[in-house]
Interface confidence: low
């Protein structure tokens, strides 16, 4: 509540997150021309990254381009990229959508299609849809522990969201356990009115808002956090503005003295922890 | 404008960036004692890193130290580091400028110079100048899409910088397209009065300020962002305070059961997106 | 001091950090069944990560699980995890504490103990204590250079913590050199009343607060930072809430065409740089 007589100051905050959970992933794996069903286990070191404070990322889906090497090859025949003669290909041209620099030659991509040859990591990444359902859809059951330390320097007051009396096996619930700071990812989405299974395919950004409305007067002292959740990316975004949340990263290695890489296009949920509020004192 | 009757609150912000562009890099490559010109393609997975929200990094230059292994070797003969006898070398000493721990012996670095032997990743990194012009100087033509979601919790108002009608092929221009949120990196530098080609050599930090001055009263509602740009690192900084922007990272691998690494000193531009502003309501 | 007549605005800040230092690590290394003492050197590329602005991480300790491969194996026999028959093991069950998915079989872990078999990265991570003393305890002598650029957009005023007159070989001291922005990590801990050697074992979070109280009136202008330090993680935290600061990351590689990984559980200090303050002008 707004107490106009109080001297208010904004919160200074530090956040630490810890994700827990294991996902079993089943996908088609092709080796030596034979495709078979592969099972693999993903733990925190596989699906999350050592990130800083106010954000953490959980990979929920991916597309791999294995064994890429720097050479010349036909670019991917996406809409409008096919050619019938060298005239269509411009030496030195970099199409923002493409993954390489054109050599000026029109070459066969497969038996039926020709595209401009590019200098690139080859074979170029196929522009295929993210797998549906998402490969790590079971991330819905992962949990995240959020530790939040806050400080009102002007009032020389410090506290944190985790109290000594809290139970490490609790799970946040808006009604039954609103002070527990262990959150099931699926519950966060439910609270925000979003469908985890759906968002997991393309990725997205989810906000976890921690609001501290602190009255620091000794006679009516209260200072506990309130958690709320809202989706931060635009689910209705036009294709040209890159809907969802994904990024590419590479694992580099050498094979027969040739540098190669596996390119991973990782889709997932970035969780942004947005801490705000004020401390007021007479 | 300052409406004193309004209740103002600071903005709560979340940012998502997406860099696009390909660079062709030409550099001297030495293999088996033979130096030849090498061409390589760098795409987003090669020159940028999966970073969090309010910052993104674009590598514009680099120096590689390949095939380092943990052993003993002479340290790099930088100014003041040469020796003529073991007396000059102190066992267990770590010079902050050096890359290893001295063994106490003075050994030949090359035909003409001797330096203190160190326990380190060997051969130690040569302290050579960053290549000029910068290897990825063409990053000037990369573009970045910035998505910014803002929230004024006290006023229960949320909006974003990307509008449904915006065109994904636009490019920001201060006069002709001030609401487009796709920025050419070179244009950002030009707006800030800086020379991209120059900064790309040593790296630097560039601020992209997004200012939301929102009037949330229904009868005179406006809430759109204003973009401005300014350089954040000190271009006149003394050598001892590490001018520019660079960091070292390593790619580890095994060769004949020996752990080795390639050390990369990456120079580049860190872009900090600084979102600020207030929402006011009667 | 609070000048009520002044128009105050919060600081907009950008931070850049640079850590320096080398650590010599001595640990038991087992190869081909033989355990011997191994010495290795860690430099910045080994113990820190390319992180964004307001945080940096220094690894002070670690536990490695080498040569893990995706297969079936007995889970680690932590308290309450042992079994005597298959009845105790539930096919498809993922214990949040475990590192895999149970197959439903109870199998020998070693000569004396049986545990549930899991599909996981095998052999599963041993839940052993972090080494004591910490392997990189000498990180106490590392230094960090902190560059901080601040801006009061409403007052169109910009400054930074590093002045042209500063000496790059200084070290911060509360009394003798309170404006030097090169900090010895051990000194930061001492100022905060904490024991670096102790915290280095399990890791922790340390706050470096930079307070700018700026009077921008021309006749009484002052605008310099004040540094203070406080520990941000809860040293008295219950085991269930994951005390200290650690995260797991993996180095992936192929051996005889089998994908393997080395899992590193990295303990260390995350330093959060918390910049706050106001600029006031008549």
């Amino acid at each position: 509540s707004d107490k106009l007589y109080q001297r208010k100051e904004p919160v200074i905050s530090s956040v630490h997150t810890k994700v827990k959970g294991i996902a079993e992933v089943t996908e088609n794996v092709t080796e030596g021309g034979v495709t078979k069903l592969g099972h693999s286990i993903f733990d925190t070191a596989d699906y999350t990254f050592p990130l800083q404070g106010n954000s953490f990322f959980v990979m929920t889906n991916y597309v791999k381009s294995e064994g890429q090497v720097q050479t010349l090859c036909p670019e991917y025949p996406r809409r409008g990229a096919q050619c019938s003669s060298d005239r269509r290909c411009k030496k030195g041209w970099m199409d923002p959508q493409s993954k390489g620099i054109q050599t000026g030659r029109c070459v066969p991509y497969d038996k039926t299609r020709k595209t401009c040859e590019v200098s690139a990591w080859c074979p170029t990444e196929e522009e295929k849809e993210a797998p549906r359902p998402a490969l790590l859809r079971s991330a819905e059951n992962f949990t995240v522990l959020i530790k939040n330390n806050i400080h009102f320097p002007g009032h020389n007051y410090t506290t944190r969201n985790i109290l000594p009396t809290m139970n490490g096996s609790c799970t946040f619930h808006k009604t039954w356990d609103p002070q527990c700071s262990i959150f099931r990812l699926g519950d966060i989405f439910q609270e925000a009115g979003e469908n985890f299974t759906e968002v997991a395919v393309q990725g997205g950004i989810m906000g976890i808002e921690i609001y501290w409305d602190c009255n620091l007067d000794s006679w009516s002292h209260h200072c506990r956090p309130r958690y709320s959740f809202r989706r931060l990316d635009d689910k209705n975004m036009d294709e040209s503005f890159v809907p969802g949340y994904n990024f590419r990263y590479a694992k580099y290695y050498k094979e027969n003295n040739v540098e190669k890489r596996t390119l991973i296009k990782a889709f997932g949920i970035r969780f942004d922890i947005l801490v705000f509020g004020t401390g007021g004192k007479f | 404008s300052d409406k004193l009757y309004q209740r103002k609150e600071p903005v709560i912000s979340s940012v998502h960036t997406k860099v696009k562009g390909i660079a062709e890099v030409t550099e001297n490559v030495t293999e088996g004692g033979v130096t030849k010109l090498g061409h390589s393609i760098f795409d987003t997975a090669d020159y940028t890193f999966p970073l969090q929200g309010n910052s993104f990094f674009v590598m514009t230059n680099y120096v590689k130290s390949e095939g380092q292994v943990q052993t003993l070797c002479p340290e790099y003969p930088r100014r003041g580091a040469q020796c003529s006898s073991d007396r000059r070398c102190k066992k267990g000493w770590m010079d902050p400028q050096s890359k290893g721990i001295q063994t106490g012996r003075c050994v030949p670095y090359d035909k003409t110079r001797k330096t203190c032997e160190v326990s380190a990743w060997c051969p130690t990194e040569e302290e050579k100048e960053a290549p000029r012009p910068a290897l990825l100087r063409s990053a000037e033509n990369f573009t970045v899409l910035i998505k910014n979601n803002i929230h004024f919790p006290g006023h229960n108002y949320t909006t974003r910088n990307i509008l449904p009608t915006m065109n994904g092929s636009c490019t920001f221009h201060k006069t002709w397209d001030p609401q487009c949120s796709i920025f050419r990196l070179g244009d950002i530098f030009q707006e800030a009065g800086e020379n991209f080609t120059e900064v790309a050599v040593q790296g630097g930090i560039m601020g992209i300020e997004i200012y939301w001055d929102c009037n949330l009263d229904s009868w005179s509602h406006h809430c759109r962002p204003r973009y401005s740009f300014r350089r954040l690192d000190d271009k006149n900084m003394d050598e001892s305070f590490v001018p520019g922007y660079n960091f070292r990272y390593a790619k580890y691998y095994k060769e004949n059961n020996v752990e080795k690494r390639t050390l990369i000193k990456a120079f580049g531009i860190r872009f900090d997106i600084l979102v600020f502003g207030t929402g006011g309501k009667f | 001091s609070d000048k009520l007549y002044q128009r105050k605005e919060p600081v907009i800040s950008s931070v850049h950090t640079k850590v320096k230092g080398i650590a010599e690590v001595t640990e038991n290394v087992t190869e081909g069944g033989v355990t011997k003492l191994g010495h290795s050197i860690f430099d910045t590329a080994d113990y820190t990560f390319p992180l964004q602005g307001n945080s940096f991480f220094v690894m002070t300790n670690y536990v490695k699980s080498e040569g893990q491969v995706q297969t079936l194996c007995p889970e680690y026999p932590r308290r309450g995890a042992q079994c005597s028959s298959d009845r105790r093991c539930k096919k498809g069950w993922m214990d949040p504490q475990s590192k895999g998915i149970q197959t439903g079989r109870c199998v020998p872990y070693d000569k004396t103990r049986k545990t549930c078999e899991v599909s996981a990265w095998c052999p599963t991570e041993e839940e052993k204590e972090a080494p004591r003393p910490a392997l990189l305890r000498s990180a106490e002598n590392f230094t960090v250079l902190i560059k901080n650029n601040i801006h009061f957009p409403g007052h169109n005023y910009t400054t930074r913590n590093i002045l042209p007159t500063m000496n790059g070989s200084c070290t911060f001291h509360k009394t003798w050199d309170p404006q030097c922005s090169i900090f010895r990590l051990g000194d930061i801990f001492q100022e905060a009343g904490e024991n670096f050697t102790e915290v280095a074992v399990q890791g922790g979070i340390m706050g470096i607060e930079i307070y700018w109280d700026c009077n921008l009136d021309s006749w009484s202008h002052h605008c310099r930072p004040r540094y203070s330090f406080r520990r941000l993680d809860d040293k008295n935290m219950d085991e269930s809430f994951v005390p200290g600061y650690n995260f797991r990351y993996a180095k992936y590689y192929k051996e005889n065409n089998v994908e393997k990984r080395t899992l590193i559980k990295a303990f260390g200090i995350r330093f959060d740089i918390l910049v706050f303050g106001t600029g006031g002008k008549f």
Epitope: - | P164, T165, D177, N215, H222, R224 | -
Partner: nanobody
Framework: EVQLVESGGGLVQPGESLRLSCTAS????????IGWFRQAPGKEREGVSC????????AYADSVKGRFTISRDIVKHTVYLQMNSLQPEDTAVYYC????????????????????WGEGTLVTVSS
């Protein structure tokens, strides 16, 4: 599809007032620049007044300055044109139009690159 629906037109005597409303469906008014345009019989369409979302500023044709006021109610998703001291030369079909900020334009005296247009409402000023 963005729809703009004008209302409030009608027959008035010289010197009287009228308030036109433009209601937008399925889109937020703070996403667009909004303009009122008019077309008198046998004449070209002209800009009357615009409101720029970027900074909330407004612009008016010289012929209506001081008499017409453009305003907006974000809650009701409605833009208004308050017309005072109406004259016979104000007789026209009045159109509401919207377009994204990213197109630089002068809505006054007239620029018809707006993306979305209403059907129009007739205002007749006659004694």
């Amino acid at each position: 599809e963005v729809q703009l629906v004008e209302s409030g037109g009608g027959l008035v005597q010289p010197g009287e007032s009228l308030r036109l409303s433009c209601t937008a469906s399925r889109f937020m008014l703070d996403y667009y620049d909004i303009g009122w345009f008019r077309q008198a019989p046998g004449k070209e369409r002209e800009g009357v007044s615009c409101r720029f979302t970027n900074d909330g500023s407004t612009a008016y044709a010289d012929s209506v300055k001081g008499r017409f006021t453009i305003s907006r109610d974000i809650v009701k998703h409605t833009v208004y044109l308050q017309m005072n001291s109406l004259q016979p030369e104000d007789t026209a079909v009045y159109y509401c139009a919207a377009g994204p900020l990213t197109k630089r334009r002068q809505c006054v005296p007239g620029d018809f690159s707006m993306d979305f247009w209403g059907e129009g409402t007739l205002v007749t000023v006659s004694s």
